[in-house]
Amino acid sequence: FERTRSLQDPCSNCPAGTFCDNNRNQICSPCPPNSFSSAGGQRTCDICRQCKGVFRTRKECSSTSNAECDCTPGFHCLGAGCSMCEQDCKQGQELTKKGCKDCCFGTFNDQKRGICRPWTNCSLDGKSVLVNGTKERDVVCGPSPADLSPGASSVTPPAPAREPGHSPQ
């Protein structure tokens, strides 16, 4: 009778950094330069990511892990794994199709990325504006107007005694 062959795939013995070489009797061969395998048992290696142009290398590719990119100064990463670089703007601006534009009145952006957002509407919380907003900063809300009116504190001082016959001034 024919002996049962081992069910284990010989390629499963090939560690990260190698591939299972079918041309050489399934022995483990090292990944060629500029490629990697991050898991064992792979039949091919993956080509390393190239950080070119506006991308710069944050972490070099190794035989077991891909290169990692970030963006050159003046740009910031977008997308998973920094798949895109987007131009920075100044605080108080947002990036449009025509480039960086100042935030419209009533909006602000306190970062070099993202969009201009509306100032907080203090009155929705029954508060007043303590510090006005700018293109770069949101408004600062203060106590409600009622909190600021005289005699509105929780502990009211006693009213001064009035002498009879004296009308209030």
């Epitope: 591939f19 070489d21 050489r24 061969s29 060629p32 330069p33 500029n34 792979q42 290696c45 080509i47």
Partner: nanobody
Framework: EVQLLESGGGLVQPGGSLRLSCAAS????????VGWVRQAPGKGLEWVSA????????YYAESVKGRFTISRDNAKNTLYLQMSSLRAEDTAVYYC???????????????RGQGTQVTVSS
């Protein structure tokens, strides 16, 4: 048919130099990613050096940096490995290798030659 023929190996004393050649046929060496792989006695394959893409960017293993230089002569369709300051641990069979790119996006390599033996010993 793709063929790679290595030559230039031999016995050399520690500190000595050798130049290996790899004559390619069946493909244009300048249009491919190629390099050198070695196998020391009782050990697995180790990448030594490579020339990648048509721009000619080069790779060297840490163990040979500053001592080995890879180059190619496009007119002769030949790849070279200039080895200097040789050490006993450089003793191995040296193979010329050609990258193989697969449809799924992966990469392996192809060894078509018999290799050339380099022995560093006093």
């Amino acid at each position: 048919e793709v063929q790679l023929l290595e030559s230039g190996g031999g016995l050399v004393q520690p500190g000595g130099s050798l130049r290996l050649s790899c004559a390619a046929s069946g493909f244009t060496i300048s249009a491919e990613d190629v390099g050198w792989v070695r196998q020391a006695p009782g050990k697995g394959l180790e990448w030594v050096s490579a020339i990648l893409d048509s721009g000619g960017s080069t790779y060297y293993a840490e163990s040979v940096k500053g001592r080995f230089t890879i180059s190619r002569d496009n007119a002769k369709n030949t790849l070279y490995l200039q080895m200097s300051s040789l050490r006993a641990e450089d003793t191995a069979v040296y193979y010329c290798a050609r990258y193989v790119y697969h449809a799924g996006g992966g990469v392996t390599f192809d060894l078509r030659g018999q290799g050339t033996q380099v022995t560093v010993s006093s």
